[in-house]
């Protein structure tokens, strides 16, 4: 979380933005608040890329200002205008690029005063893995997909039984560049797994953590997966 | 101390290639945008071309689209001017300039390098 | 593409006047506007940036004014270091111009 406060003449308002993460070819969201004002047409929004010659957004009384846009962003950036009285300045980024990453700065004048705060993106590719049993094996096999990442993941397997054990001898994990040639799938395969035992594989990169679950006993198959972002820092 | 130094200039014939480097030092490079500035002899300054911070956007004076190139390497702190179907009148001193860290925040064009001549003759 | 136009593109004048340059954009640039002083063999400094913003170690006798299409330099007064070539450049969003420079010699 970053608090930024900024200096009118006699007044300052406080502008909170959080660091947040961007799945390449999704849209992505630009977290920023402020105090609010009473009159929209009031309020300025301005986002800001570090190093960057245009505007990233400008929204002034009430409506999008795009004159001053960089090329970059042309067509991709909207703010939630309806939010904008409560004090969300957010931005939706649409189509994340790998090159979205960077500094930003949600920067707000109101009648109140002025006010800023950077936020640190970061783009990549992360998706949720899905563990299954792989039939066509010669002995029981487990197969972890993950359909999109980057950068360049780790991948760890774990059980629940063997906790600390070291599968790394025992599994084989590729990756396959996908068609747009930047984020790949990720196969990761167990061998000589044992039933009635929960294992796990675990991605991760420096965007996203991502888990998959598979329990196996002889009645049934239970499957669980969560993906958390790593870098969700406010500011 | 901030630094810059051009190089890679020369005389090549018309329709030739050439790329010029940028080394920078003594500031966070991928901070700020750099810019390519050129004075042909005895005329005016020339904006050229810009990239942003992360190389993501690059921008072109009419006279070069098509036929520059800029582009940067964060790693190496530096920037780069593939020049391509070269003419008489590209013929200048070529500067690079640390351009805009914040738009409409911060100072631009507040540091520049030596310069390398470009000439462009048969 | 933005143009930028000087005037007057040379000026002669004496140690002690006060010199004013002005520079006309041919759509408004709001205050997106610097100016730079060049001396012979040697690359452009940043005097002037946003309109009226002193960069930081340059003379208080520099001064810049104006928005939107008119702008002005004024050297309230000249010394003998500052006989040189001027220019204005406009960076509204993502383009770079140049004017085509003003010449200030010795009367």
């Known amino acids: 979380l970053i608090i930024g406060f900024g200096i009118s003449g006699r007044h300052s308002i406080t502008v909170t933005t959080v660091a947040s993460a961007g799945n390449i070819g999704e849209d992505g969201i630009l977290s920023c608040t402020f105090e609010p004002d009473i009159k929209l047409s009031d309020i300025v929004i301005q986002w800001l890329k570090e190093g960057v010659l245009g505007l990233v957004h400008e929204f002034k009384e009430g409506k999008d200002e795009l004159s001053e846009q960089d090329e970059m962003f042309r067509g991709r950036t909207a703010v939630f205008a309806d939010q904008v009285i409560v004090g969300n300045a957010s931005l939706r980024l649409k189509n994340v690029q790998l090159t979205d990453a960077g500094t930003y700065k949600c920067y707000i004048i109101t009648s109140k005063g002025k006010g800023n705060a950077n936020l640190e993106y970061k783009t990549g590719a992360f998706s949720m893995p899905e563990v299954n049993v792989d039939y066509n094996a010669s002995s029981e096999t487990l197969r972890c997909e993950a359909p999109r990442w980057f950068p360049q993941p780790t991948v760890v397997w774990a059980s629940q039984v063997d906790q600390g054990a070291n599968f790394s001898e025992v599994s084989n994990t590729s990756f396959e560049l996908n068609s747009e040639n930047v984020t790949m799938k990720v196969v990761s395969v167990l061998y000589n797994v044992t039933i009635n035992n929960t294992y796990s594989c675990m991605i991760e990169n420096d965007i996203a953590k991502a888990t998959g679950d598979i329990k196996v006993t002889e009645s049934e198959i239970k499957r669980r997966s969560h993906l958390q972002l790593l870098n969700s820092k406010a500011s | 101390e901030v630094q810059l130094l051009e190089s890679g200039g020369g005389l090549v014939q018309p329709g030739g290639s050439l790329r010029l480097s940028c080394a920078a030092s003594g500031f966070t490079f991928s901070s700020y945008a750099m810019s390519w500035v050129r004075q042909a002899p005895g005329k005016g300054l020339e904006w050229v071309s810009a990239?942003?911070?992360?190389?993501?956007?690059?921008y072109y004076a009419d006279s070069v689209k098509g036929r520059f190139t800029i582009s940067r390497d964060n790693s190496k702190n530096t920037l780069y001017l593939q020049m391509n179907s070269l003419r008489a009148e590209d013929t200048a001193v070529y500067y690079c300039?640390?351009?805009?860290?914040?738009?409409?925040?911060?100072?631009?064009?507040?540091?520049w390098g030596q310069g390398t001549l470009v000439t462009v003759s048969s | 593409d933005i143009q930028l136009t000087q005037s007057p593109s040379t000026l002669s004048a004496s140690v002690g006047d006060r010199v004013t340059i002005t520079c006309r954009a041919s759509q408004s640039i709001r205050s997106w506007l610097a100016w730079f002083q060049q001396k012979p063999g040697k690359a452009p400094k940043l005097l002037i940036y946003k309109a009226s913003s002193l960069e930081g170690g340059v003379p208080s006798r520099f001064s810049g004014s104006g928005s939107g299409t008119e702008f002005t330099l004024t050297i309230s007064s000249l010394q003998p270091d500052d006989f040189a070539t001027y220019y204005c450049q406009q960076y509204n969003s993502y383009s770079r111009t140049f004017g085509q420079g003003t010449k200030v010699e010795i009367k």
């Open positions: 990239i942003s911070g992360g190389g993501g956007s690059t």
């Open positions: 300039a640390r351009d805009i860290q914040w738009f409409g925040e911060s100072t631009l064009f507040d540091y």
